[in-house]
Interface confidence: low
């Protein structure tokens, strides 16, 4: 005959208040004869949870039919969990004995938890846009979980960031425990459309982690790159200047046109248009009139983005005096 | 992704045997109970049986006796062998994972059809 | 065994409407109550377990409710695709019951 083995699965069961737990207990053999109990804890304190000879246990149902002659299963399920039944459980067999049931062996123990569920973890940015090649920082936040081993990961486009540090709290024992970590995470200039990620694993999510995300728009500003042209053609008096504002974000911006200093409210026409990465361009046409002009013209196409301090871009203007004497015809 | 794959189905004789297998992919299958649902065609859902990480198994009084179900977790693999079929087996069936938080019936298999029919 | 009842067993409703689908339990169950949806020719899917809580990646619009014997599903606000057969179950106690099903039909 086989030599009994008392098998408890599970080292560790969570459970959450007011659920029902339930604890397996499988044996391989049905010798010795005798009986099945359930204990907590060790030792001469320990605690009767379930006799099915003797004793009232209202809260404790058997998972299989325990008069049966070649029942193996002493699973049971203690409904109505409070935070007071957390603890060790043994299943703990006895052999027939006179004038009472001797202990035979015992089970490894499945050590009863309260486990809960973590938030869904909430990711915030920085309060103030950054611009490329510096770095910003993102928290994140979960709580109310238990037991306390968790993992966080966070990602950036799906790739694992490393520069991070996270805390749990609070350190010693609690019901429920809070983590917060913050991922340090340099911009790159085509950030506008990435993403970080902050991933929690628990052992309450069944191997579905939980994800909160940022996006680095929020976080970020791409500075424009600024050039002003003289266009090779003149329609009759008139020079035509582009400036061309580059690869920008956010899309706030104010553009002005000056003339040898004063500013001019007169623009042309302008074009806003979005690049694949999410950054802005904007052209702006600001038409000349040189019929009376000097030729020392300077303009200046000045731009301030998102806020921050304005830039600017100067063009002397080259008129010649064969231009000058042109008819009103566009010429090359 | 998190997968359940059923297979072996098909048509066999009143009073013959089938064994229908389950593959699980994408979890830990050794922490999950794991169950097998019918359903005849047009009608509602049966449970059929259950298989708990510790071996324990379970069954409705219907099939009681006719099916056992197993697992090999080596192979990530669910099975239910059906003896003495009836035309009143005849159903897809289904094979679910039991969530290990309380043993809900979270993901299922896209189901296999078995006809019991002369 | 437990048996489950649920009520209707079919119902027409509007694009846009809240409809409630309740299922009776001929003894407690312990809140272990699931409701599951399912589309012709396919497969079930879990959409609340223990009673209330919702199952990932399921929008909000679906809510359980209920204790003891009796629960209800609610959808807040009915969409094309949310016309569907709806089942409630039991898992408190071997053997697991199911309801014999809703049917929801578009008005």
């Known amino acids: 005959e086989e030599e009994l083995q008392m098998i408890q699965p599970e080292k560790l069961l969570l459970v959450t208040v007011g659920k029902t737990a339930t604890l397996h207990c499988t044996v391989t053999s049905l010798l010795p004869v005798g009986p099945v109990l359930w204990f907590r804890g060790v030792g001469p304190g320990r605690e009767l949870i379930y006799n099915q000879k003797e004793g009232h246990f209202p809260r404790v149902t058997t998972v299989s039919d325990l008069t049966k002659r070649n029942n193996m299963d002493f699973s049971i399920r203690i409904s109505s969990i409070t935070p007071a039944d957390v603890g060790t459980y043994y299943c703990v067999k006895f052999r027939k004995g006179s004038p009472e049931d001797v202990e035979f062996k015992s089970g490894p123990g499945t050590e009863m938890a309260l486990g809960a569920k973590p938030s869904a973890p909430v990711v915030l940015g920085p309060a103030a846009r950054t611009t490329p090649e510096h770095t910003v920082s993102f928290t994140c936040e979960s709580h109310g979980f238990s037991p306390r081993d968790i993992t966080l990961k966070w990602f950036k486009n799906g790739n694992e960031l490393s520069d991070f540090q996270t805390n749990v709290d609070p350190t010693g024992q609690s019901v429920a425990y809070s983590i917060r970590s913050t991922a340090r995470v340099v911009l790159d200039p085509w950030d506008v459309r990435s993403q970080v990620i902050c991933e929690v694993a628990h052992v309450t999510l069944q191997g579905d982690p939980l994800r909160g995300t940022a996006n680095l728009s929020e976080a970020i500003r791409v500075p424009p790159t600024l050039e002003v042209t003289q266009q090779p053609m003149r329609v009759g008096n008139q020079v035509n200047v582009t400036c061309q504002v580059r690869k920008f974000y956010p899309q706030s911006l104010q553009l002005t046109w000056s003339e040898n200093g004063n500013v001019c409210q007169r623009e042309t026409a302008s074009t806003l248009t979005e690049n694949k990465d999410g950054t802005y361009n904007w052209t702006s046409w600001f038409l000349v009139n040189i019929s009376d002009q000097r030729d020392d013209v300077v303009l200046t196409c000045q731009v301030k983005h998102d806020g921050q301090l304005a830039v600017s871009k100067r063009l002397a203007l080259e008129v010649t005096v064969h231009q000058k004497d042109q008819s009103s015809d566009a010429t090359p | 992704e998190v997968q359940l794959v059923e297979s072996g189905g098909g048509l066999v004789q009143p009073g013959g045997s089938l064994r229908l297998s389950c593959a699980a992919s994408?979890?830990?299958?050794?922490?999950?109970?794991m169950h097998w649902v019918r359903q005849p065609t047009g009608k509602g859902l049966e449970w059929v049986s259950t298989?708990?990480?510790?071996?324990?198994?379970y069954f409705p009084g219907s099939v009681k006796g006719r099916f056992t179900i197993s697992r090999e977790n080596a192979k990530n693999s669910l099975y239910l062998q059906m003896n003495s079929l009836r035309a009143g087996d005849t159903a897809v069936y289904y094979c679910?994972?039991?969530?290990?938080?309380?043993?809900?019936?979270?993901?299922w298999g896209q189901g296999t059809m078995v006809t019991v029919s002369s | 065994d437990i048996q489950m009842t649920q009520s209707p067993s079919s119902l027409s409703a509007s694009v846009g409407d809240r409809v409630t689908i309740t299922c009776r339990a001929s003894?407690?169950?312990?809140?272990?109550l699931a409701w599951f949806q399912q589309k012709p020719g396919k497969a079930p899917k879990s959409l609340i377990y223990?009673?209330?809580s919702l199952q990932s990646g399921v929008p909000s619009k679906f809510s359980g409710s209920g204790s003891g014997t009796d629960f209800t599903l609610t959808i807040s606000s009915l969409q094309p695709e949310d016309f569907a057969t709806y089942y409630c179950?039991?898992?408190?106690?071997?053997?697991?019951?199911f309801g014999q099903g809703t049917k929801l039909e578009i008005k």
């Open positions: 679910a994972r039991g969530g290990n938080w309380d043993d809900a019936l979270d993901i």
């Open positions: 994408g979890f830990t299958f050794s922490s999950f109970d």
């Open positions: 298989i708990g990480i510790a071996g324990d198994t």
């Open positions: 003894q407690d169950i312990n809140n272990y």
């Open positions: 223990t009673a209330s």
């Open positions: 179950q039991q898992y408190n106690t071997y053997p697991y019951t």
